[in-house]
């Protein structure tokens, strides 16, 4: 019986060009976490395996950093990074738990300020 629950940071926002930490936490179960997969909608971003450690998908290597812990750090954010992110916890003996995070990447306030008050 699966008794665990995934707690996530929920809906979060960050500025374009900045960084954000995606975090999930599995609680209320004694199941062993064997692997955590991080996905962005339909793309595999990274995997953290209890034995093999981290694998970051090559296409994201420049902008994705492992950790802290089982979390994932996204760097040099662009507006295209806006969307759903999923942490998929593979556990034994429970099975799979999935958490969802929605990230909105906003134009930086500095950029907006500069655009609005430019001197011709």
């Amino acid at each position: 019986m699966m008794t665990g629950t995934i707690e996530t940071t929920g809906n979060i926002s960050a500025e374009k060009g900045g960084s954000i930490i995606l975090q999930c936490h599995l609680s209320s179960t004694t199941a062993q976490v064997t692997q955590v997969n991080w996905e962005q909608q339909d793309q595999l971003l990274a995997i953290c395996n209890a034995d093999l450690g981290w694998h970051i998908s090559p296409s994201f290597k420049d902008r994705v950093a492992p950790g802290p812990g089982l979390g994932l750090t996204l760097q040099s954010l662009t507006v295209n990074d806006t969307g759903e992110y999923f942490c998929i916890y593979h556990t034994y003996p429970d099975g799979t738990y999935t958490g969802r995070i929605f990230l909105e990447v906003l134009e930086s306030s500095v950029a907006e300020h500069g655009a609005r008050f430019q001197i011709p």
């Epitope: 064997t34 996905e39 793309q43 595999l44 995997i47 034995d51 093999l52 034994y92």
Partner: antibody, heavy 118, light 107 residues
């Protein structure tokens, strides 16, 4: 260098049994999921079974469930496939494969031929 | 079970040609899609994993794309050693399933 070497194939009568082995070297065997995949003569690839490295959890194709058993001996760096109640349709080359993160099969053995015929 | 449909089942091409093979999953598999090359009498060889990641040691003329249900393997400039059979495979859920294969032959 990663190496996988299958053995144990051969000719067996319908209803008979056979045990395949896959000897692994060049990597930390216990850390990896291992799978068996087969290929009937002139046909495509068919996944047969898998066993996880860290938990020993096993998974089977419906076509072999209840007849085949996958197991591993991490102290011997060896993967096994016990095949019982063999049928003519089990005739194939059987490959073992290493599967990092349970996602892709990055190294394969050379295969061992199992022929089920009377 | 997730069905993998590969097309075409065979194709004839010349050295230097650009070749595209497609694979369609019966349901969304995110990017859990791998491509393998197999030559007669040999074991399959991993080319592309997780839809678009090039396996170490594989020439850059091979590339993969797609997500969800539709995927593509492209060989940008076919070489003599590329004449073989290519398979896609999903690892989204068990049972793992392969496409039927695409045989690339010399024109």
């Amino acid at each position: 260098e990663v190496q996988l070497l299958e053995s144990g194939g051969g000719l067996v009568q319908p209803g008979g049994s056979l045990r395949l082995s896959c000897a692994a070297s060049g990597f930390t065997f216990s850390s990896y999921s291992m799978h068996w995949v087969r290929q009937a003569p002139g046909k495509g690839l068919e996944w047969v079974a898998a066993i996880k490295g860290n938990t020993g959890s096993t998974y089977y194709a419906d076509s072999v469930k209840g007849r085949f058993t996958i197991s591993r001996d991490n102290s011997k760096n060896t993967l096994y496939l016990q095949m019982n109640s063999l049928r003519a349709e089990d005739t194939a080359v059987y490959y073992c494969a290493r599967v990092p993160y349970g996602v892709w099969m990055d190294y394969w053995g050379q295969g061992t031929l199992v022929t089920v015929s009377s | 079970d997730i069905q993998m449909t590969q097309s075409p089942s065979s194709l004839s091409a010349s050295v230097g040609d650009r070749v595209t093979i497609t694979c369609r999953a019966s349901q969304s598999i995110s990017s859990y899609l791998n491509w393998y090359q197999q030559k007669p009498g040999k074991a399959p060889k991993l080319l592309i994993y997780a839809a678009s990641s090039l396996q170490s040691g594989v020439p850059s003329r091979f590339s993969g794309s797609g997500s969800g249900t539709d995927f593509t393997l492209t060989i940008s400039s076919l070489q003599p050693e590329d004449f073989a059979t290519y398979y896609c495979q999903q690892s989204y859920s068990t049972p793992l399933t392969f496409g039927g294969g695409t045989k690339v032959e010399i024109k």
